[in-house]
Interface confidence: low
């Protein structure tokens, strides 16, 4: 079957890294510079992706595979195949339309990306706050107030947190 197919379609013999050149009697021509074909039997080569600006080249383009990009320091990848680079923020911040903003009281972000998330509400699990939360760190929950030895007192629990996913504007 494979032999029959190649007799009917000479392009099927062209390996990855080449294309079937209609202008040259359907012979297999190498992909021109800055282009590639990742599969055999291609009638054209695809143009290599350029890693420009905040994108930097993670893997060079070859005749058989596209270039791969990542982001320069200070940015991180978003989307399939790093289709976007988004600015990093500091821990304790989140990226909004107006740039990096500090987490609101009652929320934290321990990464350079993503949104500020509400502190854990220890009382929902019947526990008390052992260590207060900050913009960079979640609260640490300790034993329930009933479990505390006599005379021990717990830290005041945090104010109700905002809903996750809401950015300060």
């Amino acid at each position: 079957f494979e032999r029959t197919r190649s007799l009917q379609d000479p392009c099927s013999n062209c390996p990855a890294g080449t294309f079937c050149d209609n202008n040259r009697n359907q012979i297999c021509s190498p992909c021109p510079p800055n282009s590639f074909s990742s599969a055999g039997g291609q009638r054209t080569c695809d143009i290599c992706r350029q890693c420009k600006g905040v994108f930097r080249t993670r893997k060079e383009c070859s005749s058989t595979s596209n270039a791969e990009c990542d982001c320069t320091p200070g940015f991180h990848c978003l989307g399939a195949g790093c289709s976007m680079c988004e600015q990093d923020c500091k821990q304790g911040q989140e990226l909004t339309k107006k740039g990096c903003k500090d987490c609101c009281f009652g929320t934290f972000n321990d990464q350079k990306r993503g949104i500020c998330r509400p502190w854990t509400n220890c009382s929902l699990d019947g526990k008390s706050v052992l260590v207060n939360g900050t913009k960079e760190r979640d609260v640490v929950c300790g034993p329930s107030p009933a479990d505390l030895s006599p005379g021990a007192s717990s830290v005041t629990p945090p104010a109700p947190a905002r809903e996750p996913g809401h950015s300060p504007q």
Partner: antibody, heavy 120, light 112 residues
Framework: SVEESGGRLVTPGTPLTLTCTAS????????MIWVRQAPGEGLEWIGD??????TTDYASWAKGRFTISKTSTTVDLKMTSLTTEDTATYFC?????????????????WGQGTLVTVSS | DIVMTQTPASVEAAVGGTVTIKCQAS??????LAWYQQKPGQPPKLLIY???TLESGVPSRFKGSGSGTEFTLTISDLESADAATYYC??????????????FGGGTEVVVK
Amino acid sequence: SVEESGGRLVTPGTPLTLTCTASGFTISSYHMIWVRQAPGEGLEWIGDIYGGTATTDYASWAKGRFTISKTSTTVDLKMTSLTTEDTATYFCARARYSGGSYANYVFNLWGQGTLVTVSS
Amino acid sequence: DIVMTQTPASVEAAVGGTVTIKCQASQSISSYLAWYQQKPGQPPKLLIYRTSTLESGVPSRFKGSGSGTEFTLTISDLESADAATYYCQGYDWSSSNRYDNTFGGGTEVVVK
């Protein structure tokens, strides 16, 4: 703000370097573009540079004859083998990154331009 | 190479009227299209990016639409201050698309 300088009357074949000076922001955080506009004509992209890595890109017609480089506060456009067809106002502009995506950019801060006249 | 084509080259309308400017990309640029306004002796001014997002301070009389290869700028309730040349710009730099000129040829808007 951005301000272009270095435009003047030159004879064909003379090299010329234009300078774009940034104030109020750091070039290393931005993409900068050079665009030119011949008298009575439209805008023509020459090339651009990303200040963070000094990565450059050029229009195909500009490759080889135009070179963009940067310092911490300036972006230079070096032009060689000038002809009368290069007579134009040369603009420098800074990118405004849009929509949370730093993949794509538009330009919201432009200089007033500097006029280059090539004549014998 | 992607080519940006603008039509018409010139359009005339009365104060209070509406003008429509079209911009066509020779292949898809998704929604990555911007519009600029330029008045004589001045640099271009960014009006709209990402097809339809108004730049800060731009009146809502300016409206951008489209996607892929076909884009439109509509200016309604025309004012004499809208007399200018308008340029579209394709900017899908994240892909392998290459532009010899990211800008369209321009459309002159004359307000009577």
